[in-house]
């Protein structure tokens, strides 16, 4: 049966035993800046092109044992959430992966900047259709990372990022705090903000909307046909990247402002229990859970 | 995220160092009164001192970025410091990534075309 997260983002008129839109997002390229990925996993084979871009710091600790499946875990899962064959949002979207996070899931602002620059140069060399950039990472507030995101957004690229898993104001983190970026918080099957250990999803006025981000079934790098459940604002951001890819595939001329407006318009309103957020943040945090549009044109969003 | 907000740095640290244009006899010294700023991550464990992104003013060309980077290396060498240019940015932001001692920040902030300098920091999978 359909996983809860795919059911949650699907408009009622499309609900069935299966998540039906089979080829959504086919005109869009989604760039993923994350860990390495298992590119031949059954969920994503042929859907993800691994670029030769790699800029990662060395792993911490002298006794760190580099295990391939662990190195690929985060990125493989997210690629599956965006475009996976069985459990993906935008099954028709093609992806390109850049490695900016090491085997411990750690990267640098500088490495991320060089990755964003790589995307811009690729766009200039070979202009394609609409581009979505997924940044499932967060660091402290960074003026330079926010500036780079702003420049890329002004070049017509849609950037989607994780709000962060620190149960804190997203405005204190980057790229979550960049105004031009679509910043995504995480909710669970009960439409509650996601708790992650002692922490949880970030919140506040720098968050644009929320999306499913707890117990998300997706590709596991443990084996080529394995699935695993993962949680976090990265998973939430991957849902929105998939939804954005489908919207842009249906309407390639959408501006960032129009896309943002559509994402907000089609979101479920006032379903999140705001009591989870600190009192001073409740009014600032958007009570929106992302969803696909109930297309007025048959198959508009599912071509 | 969330368009329409003013930039809020939170508890983000900012060090403003006034430029003394006469120092080092810079041929392309900035206009009087402009200041380049230094930024670093407010979360101490995430800081990566020793690597800095030098961001140049918006209209700076690649050749000027390269020249500024070389100038920094030359001036640092005269003071007995080794530096390494790790990457020259162009396409999104003009600037360069440099591995150097924090002792050279004051010198770097006085270079022509410099808008601000940010110490590198960590980002994490979410």
């Amino acid at each position: 049966s359909i996983p809860w997260n795919l059911e949650r983002i699907t408009p009622p008129r499309y609900r069935a035993d299966e998540y039906q839109p089979p080829d959504g997002g086919s005109l869009v390229e989604v760039y993923l800046l994350d860990t390495s990925i298992q590119s031949d996993h059954r969920e994503i084979e042929g859907r993800v092109m691994v670029t030769d871009f790699e800029n990662v710091p060395e792993e911490d600790g002298t006794r760190f044992h580099r295990q391939a499946s662990k190195c690929d875990s985060h990125g493989t899962h997210l690629a599956g959430v965006v475009s996976g064959r069985d459990a993906g949002v935008a099954k028709g979207a093609s992806m390109r992966s850049l490695r900016v996070l090491n085997c411990q899931g750690k990267g640098t602002v500088s490495g991320t900047l060089i990755g964003l620059e790589f995307i811009r140069k690729s766009q200039l060399v070979q202009p394609v259709g609409p581009l979505v950039v997924l940044l499932p990472l967060a660091g402290g507030y960074s003026r330079v990372l926010n500036a780079a995101c702003q420049r890329l957004a002004r070049a017509g690229v849609v950037l989607v990022t994780a709000a962060g898993n620190f149960r804190d104001d997203a405005c204190l983190y980057s790229p979550a705090s960049a105004p031009e970026v679509i910043t995504v918080g995480a909710t669970n099957a009960q439409d509650q903000p996601v708790t992650l250990g002692t922490l949880g999803t970030n919140f506040g006025r720098c968050v644009d909307l929320f999306a499913p981000g707890e117990d998300i079934i997706g590709a596991s790098s443990d084996c080529s046909t394995c699935f695993v459940s993962q949680s976090g604002t990265s998973q939430a951001a991957a849902h929105v990247a998939g939804i954005a890819a489908m919207m842009l595939s249906a309407e390639p001329e959408l501006t960032l402002a129009e896309l943002r407006q559509r994402l907000i318009h089609f979101s479920a309103k006032d379903v999140i229990n705001e009591a989870w957020f600190p009192e001073d943040q409740r009014v600032l945090t958007p009570n929106l859970v992302a969803a696909l549009p109930p297309s007025t044109h048959e198959n508009l969003y599912f071509q | 995220g969330a368009m329409g907000q003013e930039d809020e740095d939170g508890d983000y640290e900012e060090l403003v160092l006034a430029l003394r244009s006469e120092e080092d006899g810079l041929a392309e010294a900035p206009e009087h009164g402009t200041t380049a700023t230094f930024h670093r991550c407010a979360k101490d464990p995430w800081r990566l001192p020793g690597t800095y992104v030098v961001v140049l003013k918006e209209e700076t060309h690649l050749s000027q970025s390269e020249r500024t980077a070389r100038r920094l290396q030359a001036q640092a060498a005269r003071r007995g410091y080794l530096t390494k240019i790790l990457h020259v940015f162009h396409g999104l932001l003009p600037g360069f990534l440099v591995k150097m001692s924090g002792d050279l920040l004051e010198l770097a902030l006085k270079l022509p075309h410099v808008d601000y300098i940010e110490e590198d920091s960590s980002v994490f999978a979410q």
């Epitope: 299966e18 059954r42 084979e45 042929g46 092109m49 691994v50 080529s224 | -």
Partner: antibody
Framework: QVQLVQSGAEVKKPGASVKVSCKAS????????ISWVRQAPGQGLEWMGW????????NYAQKVQGRVTMTTDTSTSTAYMELRSLRSDDTAVYYC????????WGQGTLVTVSS | QPVLTQPLFASASLGASVTLTCTLS???????VDWYQQRPGKGPRFVMR????????SKGEGIPDRFSVLGSGLNRYLTIKNIQEEDESDYHC?????????????FGGGTKLTVL
């Protein structure tokens, strides 16, 4: 264009081993694993297993588990399938196919097991 | 795991249409099925993938527009319109099942299509 080119026909005695190669071209080798499928004379298709070109992980069909070894050489974009302890009912045409999608196939390698 | 059942033989006149059927065993109505064409003495060729919503993804390379698919309940159909002599082939269907160590690929027995 995408091509999978397999090694030539083999005649083997029962108990021997055979190693079939499959050289891929026209796509990024590590973006798709390699599936192996065989077809006995006049019969349908039988899946034998799959190998990851990315990390070498394998997934074998129960029927051949223990007798089959699949390997890859990414430097030459070549996949290999070795079948040991051959029996007469292993006589078949052996095919490699691209990934789980199996959207491109090799021309086949006839392996005859006969005493 | 699912069992895929195909009729052994089918025939159609030149220029006519024919629909080949692949039936999944009970309980597997949501499964995707791949269709393959195998001309005499040649290797299989991917035609297209089908589920209850119709085609999944795109057709195999060089597959003409005369080939189309449909899915309904446990049945997966491959229809060939305006049949040509080169369509005379064996047609196999296949499906993936399970995950991890339980993953298998199953194939139907194949249908031999004769062009009259």
């Amino acid at each position: 264009q995408v091509q999978l080119v397999q090694s030539g026909a083999e005649v083997k005695k029962p108990g021997a081993s055979v190693k079939v190669s499959c050289k891929a071209s026209g796509y990024t080798f590590t973006s798709y694993g390699i599936s192996w499928v065989r077809q006995a004379p006049g019969q349908g298709l039988e899946w034998m297993g799959w190998i990851s070109t990315y990390n070498g992980n394998t997934n074998y069909a129960q029927k051949v588990q223990g007798r089959v070894t699949m390997t890859t050489d990414t430097s030459t974009s070549t996949a290999y399938m070795e079948l040991r302890s051959l029996r007469s009912d292993d006589t078949a045409v052996y095919y490699c196919a691209r990934g789980y999608t199996r959207d491109y196939w090799g021309q086949g390698t006839l392996v005859t097991v006969s005493s | 795991q699912p069992v895929l059942t195909q009729p052994l033989f089918a025939s159609a006149s030149l220029g006519a249409s024919v629909t080949l059927t692949c039936t999944l065993s009970s309980g597997y109505s949501s499964y995707e099925v791949d269709w393959y064409q195998q001309r005499p003495g040649k290797g299989p060729r991917f035609v297209m993938r089908v589920d209850t919503g119709g085609i999944v993804g795109s057709k195999g390379e060089g597959i003409p527009d005369r080939f189309s698919v449909l899915g309904s309940g446990l049945n997966r159909y491959l229809t060939i319109k305006n049949i040509q002599e080169e369509d005379e082939s064996d047609y196999h269907c296949g499906a993936d099942h399970g995950s991890g160590t339980n993953f298998v690929v199953v194939f139907g027995g194949g249908t031999k299509l004769t062009v009259l």
